[in-house]
Structures are given as structure tokens and as C-alpha cells.
Amino acid sequence: EPPTACREKQYLINSQCCSLCQPGQKLVSDCTEFTETECLPCGESEFLDTWNRETHCHQHKYCDPNLGLRVQQKGTSETDTICTCEEGWHCTSEACESCVLHRSCSPGFGVKQIATGVSDTICEPCPVGFFSNVSSAFEKCHPWTSCETKDLVVQQAGTNKTDVVCGPQDRLR
């Protein structure tokens, strides 16, 4: 009796179970009652990453330098090319089809997490006792200067954007 279902890595055609083509190969011809499935390797710049019965291999992704992309990992017959972004840029999506410039953290905000090729800068507001007076993709919030440790007193209070201003203590006459 002809099968109605096949084992893993097989497919049903013409009432028989045929082996799927291995990753890196495409289907040329179904198996016959005499012979196994006929498969051929994917060409240069093509891939198939699963056991399959595909009649065409997929094209490797192109990392377009005009979009700020570069090759992170070259594709093989079994894997796609992995793109990443040039220094100072990050991917706009998980698929990394284009890049945007890393965001800078404005004064009053510091860098919580430095950007990578796939994630943007994460900024955080400087809490009390910390400040940032620059727009930067790298600078964290800096702690206010401790006037006391310098034997000075606070002459001007700090904000999230400015450091405290220290001055000499008033001498008792």
C-alpha cells in the first residue's frame, strides 16, 4: 500500500517517499522506483539552509556599502551572508537591510549602553548627583565634583547638565 506520510528528511510524491536534498543542494529530479532523489549543489553566491525540495537556491544577501552595510560573515552554500553596519552606524532592523547613524545622548543624558552594529545607543537621564554637558554617543553621566574632598564648598549647585562649582570656604574672622 502506498505511504500517506514519510519519515523526517523525506517527502511524498507519486505515492512514494523520496529523500529531501541536503542543505546546500537543490532538487533536480524526484526519486524513482530504482534511484534516489537527484540533487545538485547550489551555485556560487547561492544557498539553501534546510533539507529541501527547492528547485532554486536562494541568492546570498548583498551587503550594500551605499546603505552603510558590510559583510560580517560570508555566506556558504548552506548559510546566508550576514551583514552588519560600518563603524558608527547600526542596523535599522533585525534583517539588517540598511543602517543609520548611532544616536547621541543630549546634555542631561548619559550613555547607558553603547551602540553596536545591530543596536542603537541607549541613553538615560542623569540622576541627581550626576551630569552630562555634552552630546555624545559614548559619554556616561559623570558624578558631580565632591567639593568637600577638596576642602572646598559648593558655590553653585550642580544640575543634570552642569557640574557643581566649588569655591573656598569663608574664613572665620
Partner: antibody
């Protein structure tokens, strides 16, 4: 059961044209590459051409490039070979075969004779 | 697209083993394990007897075996029988996505 039934052979003058057909049955024609192989009288086998499942890839032996065209009609389960600018050296038995590079099934063959 | 090289003829006595060689290049036999062997009796279509270098189609006698070393493939027929008398052709897929056949070998069973 798998069957490949050929037609279209015959006598043709040098420079003439002919179209060979191969009607397939007993298998899923549209998921298989198909090929043509020829054999001159008293000579060996010579691979001529093959075509992928949807006709987007076609390959030919150098000696027939630009003169012969392989094609298929998946709706009709048929394979074709258009032979143009025929030469005496194209005289041969022409076989259609199922597959891209190995052939478990062959047509019965059709004789093409190029002679004036 | 040069034909693969086979000896024109090979002969042996019944019960003997014979080997038919098939020599190609790096860009066909050397680079691919897509070598097939066909048997052809006079007036008949070829019959596939070995594929993918050493696989035997079901129903083909296990007296036929195939192998490959470098750019040369071989077909061995053991326990030679009268019905083995035929022409034998090797073929290989090539780097230019084409197929090439050998010139053919006439196997004669003596006696």
C-alpha cells in the same frame, strides 16, 4: 508507470529544421529536470541539452549552441527540442530522458536524418 | 567539452571479473560524485546500472559495482555472464553545468 513517448523525427535537408517532442506520463513532470541525448549511427552517446523544472535554466553541448533550443510545457507534460540549421553530423537517434545528469528513464528514441 | 576516455573494448571469460575505466578531468569526474554508468544492448535504449559513482539502481545485479579515484571512475563486472556482452558508457556532471559521456566500451564475453 513512467513513460516517455517521442515523436517528430524524420529526413531533413541540411540547413533545415525539425521539432522533436517527448510526452511524459506516470510521474510529476513539473518537478523534474529533463534532458536530450543523441547517438549517431554506430557511435557513442552524446549529451545534447537539459532544462530545469520551470524552464529558467537550459544547458547545451557546445556543438548545438545557437542552433538547438530545448523547451517544455508543464501543462502538457511535454518536452521539446527545436533543431535548426541542421548539419549532416546531427544525424542521430535522439532520446529524451528524465533527469538532469542521470537517466533511469529514456524515451524509445527518434531518428533524425540530415541528408540532401 | 571533451568526451571522457574509455577503452574501446574489454573482454573476459565467463565467471571472470573485468574493470572498465573512465578518465576525465578535475572539472568533471574529479570534482563531482555524479558519475553514472549505462549498459546498452544493440538496438535498445541505454539502461542505468550505476549512479552517483557507486550506487546501484534497485533491480540491477550486484555483480556491477562502481568506484572513483581522482579523475578516473571504474565499473567492475564480476562473475561475467553472456548477457553482460554490451556497450558500456560512463557519464559525469561537469563544472559548466553540462553532462559529458565517455566514448563507450564494448564488453565481449569470450567462449
Amino acid at each position: 508507470q513512467v513513460q516517455l513517448v517521442q515523436s517528430g523525427g524524420g529526413l531533413v535537408q541540411p540547413g533545415g529544421s525539425l521539432r522533436l517532442s517527448c510526452a511524459a506520463s506516470g510521474f510529476t513532470f513539473s518537478s523534474n529536470w529533463m534532458s536530450w541525448v543523441r547517438q549517431a549511427p554506430g557511435k557513442g552517446l552524446e549529451w545534447v541539452a537539459n532544462i530545469n523544472q520551470d524552464g529558467s535554466e537550459k544547458y547545451y553541448v557546445d556543438s548545438v549552441k545557437g542552433r538547438f533550443t530545448i523547451s517544455r510545457d508543464n501543462a502538457k507534460n511535454s518536452l521539446y527540442l527545436q533543431l535548426n540549421s541542421l548539419r549532416a553530423e546531427d544525424t542521430a537517434e535522439y532520446y529524451c530522458a528524465r533527469g538532469g545528469y542521470r537517466y533511469a528513464y529514456w524515451g524509445q528514441g527518434t531518428l533524425v536524418t540530415v541528408s540532401s | 567539452q571533451s568526451a571522457l576516455t574509455q577503452p574501446a573494448s574489454v573482454s573476459g571469460s565467463p565467471g571472470q571479473s573485468i574493470t572498465v575505466s573512465c578518465t576525465g578531468t578535475r572539472s568533471d569526474i574529479g570534482d563531482y560524485n555524479y558519475v553514472s554508468w549505462y549498459q546498452q544492448h544493440p538496438g535498445k535504449a541505454p539502461k542505468l546500472i550505476i549512479y552517483d559513482v557507486s550506487s546501484r539502481p534497485s533491480g540491477v545485479s550486484n555483480r556491477y559495482s562502481g568506484s572513483k579515484s581522482g579523475n578516473t571512475a571504474s565499473l567492475t563486472i564480476s562473475g561475467l555472464q553472456a548477457e553482460d556482452e554490451a556497450d558500456y558508457y560512463c557519464s559525469s556532471y561537469t563544472s559548466s553545468s553540462t553532462l559529458v559521456f565517455g566514448g563507450g566500451t564494448k564488453v565481449t564475453v569470450l567462449g
